[in-house]
């Protein structure tokens, strides 16, 4: 009888140890969950604040209204310039207004002085019409001054405060443009 009671007692003690272990595991799990929750909240907070503080334009790009501009430090032909811009998620500069033209030429004066910069303008080989790279026509006040007597493909570039034209295979600096990130505030 005594042996039976002692066996039962041992079994109960074993059960108790298992329950204590389970409780310890549960407490540990709960703490880990709380830590993960805290981490998660911190991560969300950081993401939100970094999104909040993120600049509308990447480093080394200039902002004006809804656009970001990058002035290249290398020379390339028109087609390669376009590809260089595309790799950065941008296109060659497309000047929509006199205000934008003034901003660009003013910025260039501050940055580099009087160099040639490709923009996203080219002449249709068949009709001789000037077109921006997205297929739209430039406004009458933003047509290149006739300068190129080239039989080859002709493209537009900016120099000082003028829009000029040249053989697309000549080497020039270039300007890329992309949309600025909108602040969600």
């Amino acid at each position: 009888k005594l042996l039976q009671v002692s066996t039962i007692a041992m079994q109960q003690q074993e059960k108790l140890i298992q329950q204590e272990r389970a409780l310890l595991n549960f407490t540990e799990w709960k703490r880990s969950c709380a830590l993960q929750m805290k981490y998660c909240q911190a991560f969300m907070q950081n993401s939100l604040s970094s999104a909040h503080n993120s600049s509308p334009c990447p480093n080394n790009w200039i902002q004006n209204r809804e656009s970001c501009y990058y002035v290249s430090e290398i020379w390339s032909i028109w087609h390669t310039s376009q590809e260089n811009c595309l790799k950065e998620g941008s296109t060659l500069l497309q000047i929509e207004s006199k205000e934008e033209m003034d901003f660009i030429t003013g910025s260039l004066r501050k940055i580099k002085g009087s160099y040639d910069y490709w923009v996203g303008l080219s002449q249709d080989g068949h009709s001789g019409r000037w077109l921006w790279q997205d297929g739209s026509s430039p406004s009458p006040g933003l047509l290149p001054a006739e300068r190129s007597q080239s039989a080859n493909q002709v493209c537009g570039y900016v120099k000082s405060n003028s829009l000029l034209s040249s053989n697309c295979s000549t080497w020039k600096y270039f300007i890329c443009e992309k949309y600025a990130l909108r602040s969600s505030v």
Epitope: E83, L86, K87, G89, S90, Q133, K178, Y179
Partner: nanobody, 115 residues
Framework: QVQLQESGGGLVQPGGFLSLSCAAS????????MAWYRQVPGKQRELVAA???????AYAPSVNGRFTISRDYAKNTIHLQMNSLEPEDTAVYYC?????????WGQGTQVTVSS
């Protein structure tokens, strides 16, 4: 990695039209622009049209006004609608995904403009 698969190439008469599609899969978050290039044997691959992740468009002077690029974000595909095709448009057309570090290429699809 980004995988690209073109479709829609074929034989078309001068003045006709054709529509190319490119299905993209993989790490599309790393892609800054999607583009169509073309290559004629013995010549360099040339950019035809492109669309940036922000939706800006760019066309090569030779196709500007005739070709239209578009993107279906839900299906991760880009399309190239080619109108008023000319014999000079005959080439292998490649879909490309560009970022600052690399360019991913599809296998290409043949477009032949001939009467």
């Amino acid at each position: 990695q980004v995988q690209l698969q073109e479709s829609g190439g074929g034989l078309v008469q001068p003045g006709g039209f054709l529509s190319l599609s490119c299905a993209a899969s993989g790490s599309m978050h790393s892609v800054n622009s999607m583009a169509w290039y073309r290559q004629v044997p013995g010549k360099q691959r040339e950019l035809v049209a492109a669309i940036t992740s922000g939706g800006r468009l760019a066309y090569a002077p030779s196709v500007n006004g005739r070709f239209t690029i578009s993107r279906d974000y839900a299906k991760n595909t880009i399309h190239l609608q080619m109108n008023s095709l000319e014999p000079e448009d005959t080439a292998v057309y490649y879909c490309a995904a560009l970022n600052s570090a690399t360019t991913y290429w599809g296998q290409g699809t043949q477009v032949t403009v001939s009467s």
